[in-house]
Interface confidence: low
């Protein structure tokens, strides 16, 4: 079938391949201090690391990309590490009428894969 | 709001930023010559190019990533160019009982964004 099994063990060594990592950021870092009230500090999960051949392939396209990158590295980029799913986060922010709680569905990564 | 407008003009010059590009590949390139009968050659649309700050941001997470990359480039990677949608492709392939047509929904990219 077109779907080879995505590889799950990192051939580059511990912590080198595509994985979820927490980055601490303040509202000032994000440029949000003027409109977000809370939380003042966010633990942002982000996808970092490399995508060696077939590691955590998102889909058939990513597998093809990995293969063609091996054949034509100057023309076809390697797959890269991006979120596969997100965790909803609630922010309290200023509105014209006061304060509001709003859920953001696409703000913090929950899982990563190579696309 | 958390959603800044993704930027659509490429500040790096024509063809340098994240875009769809056609790569020609044979079944041999893909390692599929033993099970796919047709087409012998595929025009594969792939996402290539760079993702400068806020260019075609996929979502809020990508905008945050772009901003934090500006602040901590060694820790937070820049967003990268990946498919935003796919075009279904029909492949004719061998089966135990003969020949079958199968649609692959995630094989050829139709649009790109920075994630």
């Amino acid at each position: 079938s077109a779907h080879a099994h995505p590889r799950d063990s990192c051939p580059l060594g511990p912590g080198r391949c595509c994985h979820l990592e927490t980055v601490q950021a303040t509202l000032e870092d994000l440029g949000w201090s003027d409109w977000v009230l809370s939380p003042r500090q966010l633990q942002l999960s982000m996808c970092v690391g490399e995508c060696p051949h077939l590691y955590r392939s998102a889909n058939t396209h990513a597998q093809i990309k990995a293969r063609l990158h091996g054949l034509q590295p100057d023309k076809v980029p390697a797959p890269c590490c991006v979120p596969s799913s997100y965790t909803p986060v609630v922010l309290m922010h200023r509105t014209d009428s006061g304060v509001s709680l709003q859920t953001y569905d696409d703000l913090v990564a929950r899982g990563c894969h190579c696309a | 709001s958390a959603h800044a407008h993704p930027r659509d003009s490429c500040p790096l010059g024509p063809g340098r930023c994240c875009h769809l590009e056609t790569v020609q590949a044979t079944l041999e390139d893909l390692g599929w010559s033993d099970w796919v009968l047709s087409p012998r050659q595929l025009q594969l649309s792939m996402c290539v190019g760079e993702c400068p700050h806020l260019y075609r941001s996929a979502n809020t997470h990508a905008q945050i990533k772009a901003r934090l990359h500006g602040l901590q480039p060694d820790k937070v990677p820049a967003p990268c160019c990946v498919p935003s949608s796919y075009t279904p492709v029909v492949l004719m392939h061998r089966t135990d009982s003969g020949v079958s047509l199968q649609t692959y929904d995630d094989l050829v990219a139709r649009g790109c964004h920075c994630a």
């Epitope: 440029g31 | 800044a4 407008h5 930027r7 659509d8 003009s9 500040p11 790096l12 010059g13 340098r16 760079e50 400068p52 700050h53 806020l54 772009a66 901003r67 990359h69 500006g70 602040l71 480039p73 060694d74 820049a78």
Partner: antibody
Framework: QVQLVQSGAEVKKPGASVKVSCKAS????????INWVRQAPGQGLEWMGW????????NYAQKLQGRVTMTTDTSTSTAYMELRSLRSDDTAVYYC????????????WGQGTMVTVSS | DIQMTQSPSSVSASVGDRVTITCRAS??????LAWYQQKPGKAPKLLIY???SLQSGVPSRFSGSGSGTDFTLTISSLQPEDFATYYC?????????FGGGTKVEIK
């Protein structure tokens, strides 16, 4: 902290060239672009061009095309702007300014370099 | 090239006043607009990027709004240190262009 430190004031004769340097510190030089902006005495800001530190790609203002060259030296985290065939209306303060990523907004500026063109 | 037209070119105001400066682009630039403050003999300082985002360390009395072609910088309550010249800049495409500047003077 993030800093851009420019070379000192210059006095040049018409027809000569000037090369202004801009040394970056406090951040990864190759992850950012550098803009050059000038300001004639009592006038507004004029964008001259932009260079990506990581690849050396440039984009120059049309009116300066052919007279300006922007370069970077990644080994010393320094950007350079050379302006040739100087005229009296090139008298200005020249600023280098960093942009986040390769983006065009400029968040950190050098202190400026006064270039006087006079016979 | 995209032309940026700023108005007024100068404004006289008192401490505590609300000051509004406008900037108009000759074509749509989405939200790719920045505002800078410049004091005599000093380099410009970024106040607002992406039309409405406050740069880190800038007082919250500064705010930006607008999208497309029309943009506004507002200083909600003018302070003594705010007397300066303000510039808008479009970051939508090369060549980057600045507005002509607005000088905020003491009345």
């Amino acid at each position: 902290q993030v800093q851009l430190v420019q070379s000192g004031a210059e006095v040049k004769k018409p027809g000569a060239s000037v090369k202004v340097s801009c040394k970056a510190s406090g951040y990864t030089f190759t992850s950012y672009g550098i803009n050059w902006v000038r300001q004639a005495p009592g006038q507004g800001l004029e964008w001259m061009g932009w260079i990506t530190a990581y690849s050396g790609d440039t984009n120059y203002a049309q009116k300066l095309q052919g007279r300006v060259t922007m370069t970077t030296d990644t080994s010393t985290s320094t950007a350079y702007m050379e302006l040739r065939s100087l005229r009296s209306d090139d008298t200005a303060v020249y600023y280098c300014a960093r942009g986040p990523g390769q983006y065009a907004d400029v968040d950190v500026w050098g202190q400026g370099t006064m270039v006087t063109v006079s016979s | 090239d995209i032309q940026m037209t700023q108005s007024p070119s100068s404004v006289s105001a008192s401490v505590g006043d609300r000051v509004t400066i406008t900037c108009r682009a000759s074509q749509g630039i989405s939200s790719w607009l920045a505002w800078y403050q410049q004091k005599p003999g000093k380099a410009p300082k970024l106040l607002i990027y992406a039309a409405s985002s406050l740069q880190s360390g800038v007082p919250s009395r500064f705010s930006g709004s607008g999208s497309g072609t029309d943009f506004t910088l507002t200083i909600s309550s003018l302070q003594p240190e705010d007397f300066a010249t303000y510039y808008c800049q479009q970051a939508s495409q090369f060549p980057i262009t600045f507005g002509g500047g607005t000088k905020v003077e003491i009345k």
